[in-house]
């Protein structure tokens, strides 16, 4: 059956031979209606990439550099399956490119000019492409030929395989730049030895190199890693201090109609039958015909790449930046230490309009990027298409797991002028019901629920976390008879109450009328039995404070809070009747942009913050007629975080633990991708 056939692309006679053997052996173990292998031979990996894009083949395994080529238009391929190394219990699908230095030296990443450098080899990922790609815009002009620019940047180097005649400085630390192990400073161990011997000041290697060469922790403690934010960390903190995370070897397919489920079914079956130590007659991860045919010999198996993970996310911002710099050879005109405009991520067209107005008022210091969901915005910030946005705590958690950092907190209670330097404790997550109902926390089963959105703090993580510990399962759509929880599966009962309009029904953005705090409260007013919101929601939308037709006649006394002890209290008593304390919303950004974002936002709020009194004829950053666009409308200021500058420290141990527990019930494709 052609649609059940995976056409594997082979790039040599030896690979084609192994592919045919793979095909024949898979035929013998798979049912006739299962996936099958067909072999397509091409002259090179680039030809394979083009063949897959043109639907003449379906899959090929590529190194990271080629995954980048495969992702570029017009190829538009995506990673679907990753090889892993090490054990099944602790599978490694990535390695980290790092810059290692001796602890007793005193320079940072931005002070490498004039130092002596040790590289694994010319054109190699960790030893050359990544460090030189990231340093590219700091190299002296002209930057071509690249070797000459690098020779003029460092005061001396060992770059195995470089041309010692044309670029003698690149071979200063290893005369001749030998391209094999005859050169004592060749490859990973060699580059590290170059540093260890004192020949060089910095070695560009992979994270495992130090551990492979220094078994003794005391010896390893004599070295540190240089981080991109111009700090240093110990060698075992490579996950938080690296130049780039590099995927090892990856199967790619078309982004649309790419047969990724079929490819996974095939490879999963293949590793069961012909993986490490599985079969004598055919081995997936070795071959009598040559080394690394179709797959790496060192691979131990395959892992399915999460569907939300596109090539940009898979390769990572740093890796793509490095490779793009090298390939395109373009650098910004502005010096790299100058803050470029900050690209704010706006959700759907409502936020985009407010962002546009901000952009005009900021004279272009703010630019705008749009996405349809918060998770899409976070992904855009990760890959550099956007720089920052303000997020509810639940999404601060996801953003943190995806490598972003909190930059400033929204403050709601502290009056100026102390606001900017005050760390507030947070707001209360509450359950609101109509005063006329007889509901309590203990009899919510079968009732109609209203949520701000799936994954948000007050609307989801806190109430559903509490509910989970009571019911011990994730079928929340069965607990409530129906509800509106934007971001739920469209056919779920938790989308039934949503108002839309269609096609935006149940979408987690302002196009869905019941989205957010105000939306969830509106859902309660019009259709629901209980709304999970922040403690300020009822006062902010009653007594004529919200002029919209549905809200203008509402009275605060017609609503009450549910307390966890089964009692109810007035909406004026959230301190004594709440579900939990929630961390304030916070602005997040990539680490490399955090300082810029903070500086610019503090400047912007001085001009457009809560000191502006007339928002009808002036732009106000924290105002959008109860719609909480870009920021919560009740924000007084954006406040510095001081030492709460990681998502764990910002959210607090208790909240992180609660959300981590709820991950069993996670419907977040982004979180799945970021924890791959």
């Amino acid at each position: 059956v052609p649609e059940k056939s995976v056409r594997w692309c082979a790039v040599s006679e030896h690979e084609a031979t192994k592919c045919q053997s793979f095909r024949d052996h898979m035929k013998s173990v798979l049912p006739s209606n299962g996936p099958s292998v067909a072999c397509v031979k091409k002259a090179s990996h680039l030809d394979c990439i083009r063949a897959i894009a043109a639907n003449e083949a379906d899959a090929v395994t590529l190194d990271a550099g080629l995954v980048y080529d495969a992702y570029l238009a017009p190829n538009n391929l995506k990673p679907v399956v990753a090889e892993f190394y090490g054990s099944k219990e602790d599978p490694q699908t990535f390695y980290y490119a790092v810059a290692v230095v001796k602890k007793d030296s005193d320079f940072q990443m931005n002070q490498l000019r004039g130092r002596k450098s040790c590289h694994t080899g010319l054109g190699r990922s960790a030893g050359w492409n990544i460090p030189i790609g990231l340093l590219y815009c700091d190299l002296p002009e002209p930057r071509k030929p690249l070797e000459k620019a690098v020779a003029n940047f460092f005061s001396g180097s060992c770059v195995p395989c470089a041309d010692g005649t044309d670029f003698p400085q690149l071979c200063q630390l290893c005369p001749g730049c030998g391209c094999s192990t005859l050169n004592q400073y060749f490859s990973y161990s060699g580059a590290f030895k170059c540093l260890k011997d004192g020949a060089g000041d910095v070695a560009f290697v992979k994270h495992s190199t130090i551990f492979e060469n220094l078994a003794n922790k005391a010896d390893r403690d004599q070295y540190e890693l240089l981080c991109l934010d111009n700090t240093r960390k110990s060698v075992d903190e490579y996950k938080d201090c690296h130049l780039a995370r590099v995927p090892s070897h990856t199967v790619v397919a078309r982004s649309v109609g790419g047969k990724e489920d079929l490819i996974w079914e095939l490879l999963n079956q293949a590793q069961e039958h012909f993986g490490k130590d599985k079969s004598k007659e055919f081995q997936l991860f070795s071959s009598p015909h040559g080394k690394d045919l179709l797959f790496k010999d060192s691979a131990h198996g395959f892992l399915k790449v999460p569907p939300r993970m596109d090539a940009k996310m898979y390769l990572g911002y740093e890796y793509i930046t490095a490779i793009r710099n090298l390939r395109e050879g373009t650098c910004p005109e502005a010096p790299t230490d100058e803050c470029k405009p900050v690209k704010w991520c706006a959700l759907s067209h409502h936020e985009r309009l407010k962002c546009d107005e901000w952009s005009v008022n900021s004279a272009g210091k703010i630019e705008c990027e749009s996405a349809e969901t918060t998770e899409d915005c976070i992904a855009k910030i990760m890959n550099g298409e956007a720089d920052a946005m303000s997020l509810d705590g639940g999404f601060v958690y996801i953003a943190g797991m995806c490598g972003l950092v909190p930059v400033l907190a929204e403050n709601y209670n502290t009056p100026n002028p102390n606001c900017e330097n005050t760390a507030e404790e947070g707001y209360f997550a509450v359950a609101v019901v109509k005063s006329s109902s007889d509901l309590t926390w203990d009899n919510l089963k079968g009732k109609k629920s209203c949520h701000t959105a799936v994954g948000r703090t007050a609307g989801w993580n806190i109430p559903m976390g509490l509910l989970y510990s009571k019911i011990n399962h994730c079928r929340f759509d069965e607990f409530f008879s129906e509800g509106c929880a934007p971001g739920s599966e469209k056919n779920s009962s938790l989308c039934k109450l949503c108002m839309g309009p269609s096609p935006n029904l149940c979408e987690p953005n302002n196009k869905e009328g019941y989205y957010g705090y105000t939306g969830a409260f509106r859902c309660l007013v019009e259709k629901g039995d209980v709304a999970f919101v922040k403690h300020q929601t009822v006062p902010q939308n009653t007594g004529g404070k919200n002029p919209d037709a549905w809200a203008k006649n509402l009275k605060e006394e017609d609503y009450e809070l549910l307390c966890l002890d089964g009692s109810r209290k007035s909406v004026q008593e959230p301190a004594n009747c709440h579900l939990a304390r929630a961390p304030n919303h916070a602005v997040v950004a990539r680490k490399d942009k955090a300082d810029c974002v903070q500086t610019l936002l503090l400047d912007q709020q001085r001009m457009f913050g809560s000191s502006v009194t007339d928002c009808s004829s002036n732009f106000c950053l924290f105002e959008s007629k109860t719609k909480d666009l870009l920021f919560r409308d009740d924000t007084v200021c954006l406040a510095k975080l001081h030492d709460r500058n990681t998502y764990e420290k910002y959210l607090g141990e208790e909240y992180v633990k609660a959300v981590t527990n709820l991950r069993k019930c996670s419907t977040s494709p982004l979180l799945e991708a970021c924890t791959f």
Epitope: H350, L353, N361, A363, S617, N618, F619, S624, K625, L629
Partner: nanobody, 117 residues
């Protein structure tokens, strides 16, 4: 509520110029930001240029150096002077004053600009 009406569109050759006007009924003196947007067939509506009451302006990268936004508060009008027009500038152009605070429908009829030889 302020009512806005766009005019001045038309057919123009590549390299040519046009000036769009947006007249407000009601006083635009109380309005802070005015902006021109455009929407090409099958594309999202995008910000072209904006101007604040104090005269701060901002332009989309694709029109910088070719388009100029200005406003005349006495005439309750905002203008978009478009020079060196390109085929990719073809779109319906709308003006807005943001007074509806972003979430009600704020678009008038717009004015069609077609750049073609």
């Amino acid at each position: 509520q302020v009512k806005l009406e766009e005019s001045g569109g038309g057919l123009v050759q590549p390299g040519g110029s046009l000036t769009l006007s947006c007249a407000a009924s009601g006083s635009i003196f109380s309005i802070n930001t005015m902006a021109w947007y455009r929407q090409a067939p099958g594309k999202q509506r995008e910000l072209v240029a904006g101007i604040t009451r104090s005269g701060t302006t901002n332009y989309a990268g694709s029109v910088k150096g070719r388009f100029t936004i200005s406003r005349d508060n006495a005439k309750n009008t905002v203008y978009l002077q478009m020079n060196s027009l390109k085929p990719e500038d073809t779109a319906v152009y709308y003006c807005t004053d943001y007074s509806r605070k972003y979430y009600e429908d704020q678009w008038g009829q717009g004015t069609q600009v077609t750049v073609s030889s």
